[in-house]
């Protein structure tokens, strides 16, 4: 006897990182025939949607027109078919950005590095924060967390060409309230010092600090739910 339905998928469009005063839509995808979806915020009921007609709809959207720090936090959703409720979705961490100040980001030895060299990013923010986040832009976005009174170090490497890309950092005032992003730093990785033909497709990062999270883009949304389930909860917890 089945006691619950499979958990729905939850994600944010266009992104789980939302600049303050901007809009965001939380999407919850369950099953066709679901008569009710509930969105929970920080463990409490936040919103309800009853799709019509339920047999033709398997996804609902909860629209937040004006993001602020009160709306930032952990969301989950559930759905109901008849009297049977689903398992709750994974947690979606919705982050408000562009709060207060802008950090500065520098990279050592510089933005142009040689394959095999070790690289360190430094993020600095003079206002009261002790947690920093470094993000690499792209569809498969890597987020690293660092700590320090006014600045944090983010070691990388030895780098391969897979580390090429644009990096930004944020100061974090709490888990769900981040600063403005720093100016971007574009890391260029050139010429192999040694044979790096066996280098992995994607850089490997220390397991305790790195997670892989998919970012939505305005040019198209990835509908692979197995991938969409990787939201930022591991980073932010």
């Amino acid at each position: 006897q089945q006691q619950t339905l499979p958990k729905p998928f939850i994600w944010a469009e266009p992104h789980f990182m939302v600049p303050k005063e901007k809009q965001v839509t939380i999407c919850c995808q369950g099953n066709y025939g679901a008569v009710e979806y509930q969105l929970h915020f920080e463990g409490s009921l936040f919103a309800v949607d009853r799709p019509k007609p339920p047999e033709r709809i398997n996804k609902v959207q909860f629209y937040i027109p004006d993001m602020n720090s009160r709306m930032a936090g952990q969301y989950s959703c559930i759905y109901r078919v008849g009297e049977l409720w689903s398992e709750p979705s994974n947690l979606l961490d919705l982050v408000v950005t562009e709060m207060y100040d802008t950090p500065t980001l520098s990279v050592h030895p510089g933005p142009e590095v040689i394959s095999g060299e070790k690289v360190t990013f430094y993020c600095r923010l003079d206002t009261a924060t002790s947690m920093f986040l470094l993000l690499k832009e792209g569809r498969s976005s890597h987020v690293q967390r660092g700590y320090g009174k006014v600045q944090a170090e983010f070691p990388l490497g030895p780098v391969t060409t897979a580390h090429r890309g644009t990096y930004r950092c944020f100061g974090s005032y709490n888990n769900h309230a981040w600063s403005f992003p720093s100016e971007p730093v574009k890391l260029l990785v050139t010429g192999d010092i040694e044979n790096t033909s066996l280098a992995p497709e994607d850089p490997t990062f220390p397991a305790d600090t790195w997670g892989t999270y998919l970012l939505t883009t305005e040019t198209g949304l990835q509908k692979d739910h197995a991938l969409w389930d990787h939201t930022a909860q591991n980073l932010l917890r």
Epitope: S106, P109, G110, I114, E117, K118, T120, Y122, R124, P158
Partner: antibody, heavy 115, light 107 residues
């Protein structure tokens, strides 16, 4: 070409402070890290710290925290190291070096701490 | 901190001889290693960066290589101006650290 100009020598009293300069030219000052290193007579080199003129981000060798303070003046393309509470142990040659990979080096400033 | 153990601390050699200096890193530094040359007047010049890349203007008789955690500077045929001090420097992990130095003396 890149030049890093440092004063030749300076004599200071024990307990005093001194601010050493490194005037850069021949490259974009704000785009490169500036390192400082110390070399005691007949000894090897020690890294003091570095600073990025564009961001103001600085990083120190734990050994020199409280002893050295790094600053820059971007208007004059000059980097500084401030050494405080000087003792005979601080008598050394102090070098500035440009770039994350220590691409170029100044000629060094000899600091003599003596009463 | 990463320790850079440089050997030998001093080396006597003859003109035209081939010599190698070695630095061993206590932790992985990738290819983030320089070789520096210091003249008797204190002037410091970088010879090699990123383990094996020769700086412009540096004679081809200098070369750098790596085997595991051992990094080497080789001078293929010593000339009179090469009899000075040499240091390795890792810039992989802060604090950046130097080897203890090698004094190259003429035999």
């Amino acid at each position: 070409q890149v030049q890093l100009q440092q004063p030749g020598s300076v004599l200071v009293r024990p307990g005093a402070s001194v601010k050493l300069s490194c005037k850069a030219s021949g490259y974009t000052f704000t785009s490169s890290w500036m390192h400082w290193a110390k070399q005691r007579p007949g000894q090897g080199l020690e890294w003091i710290g570095h600073i990025h003129p564009n961001s103001g981000i600085s990083n120190y060798n734990e050994k020199f925290k409280g002893k050295a303070t790094l600053t820059v003046d971007t208007s004059s393309s000059t980097a500084y190291v401030d050494l405080s509470s000087l003792t005979s142990e601080d008598s050394a040659v102090y070098y500035c070096s440009r770039g994350g990979r220590f691409d170029d080096w100044g000629a060094g400033t000899t600091v003599t701490v003596s009463s | 901190d990463i320790q850079m153990t440089q050997s030998p601390s001093s080396l006597s050699a003859s003109l035209g001889e081939r010599v190698s200096l070695t630095c061993r890193a206590s932790q992985d530094i990738g290819s983030s290693l320089n070789w520096l040359q210091q003249e008797p007047d204190g002037t410091i010049k970088r010879l090699i960066y990123a383990t094996s890349r020769l700086d412009s203007g540096v004679p081809k008789r200098f070369s750098g290589s790596r085997s595991g955690s051992d990094y080497s500077l080789t001078i293929s045929s010593l000339e009179s101006e090469d009899f000075v001090d040499y240091y390795c420097l890792q810039y992989a992990s802060s604090p950046w650290t130097f080897g203890g130095g090698t004094k190259l003396e003429i035999k």
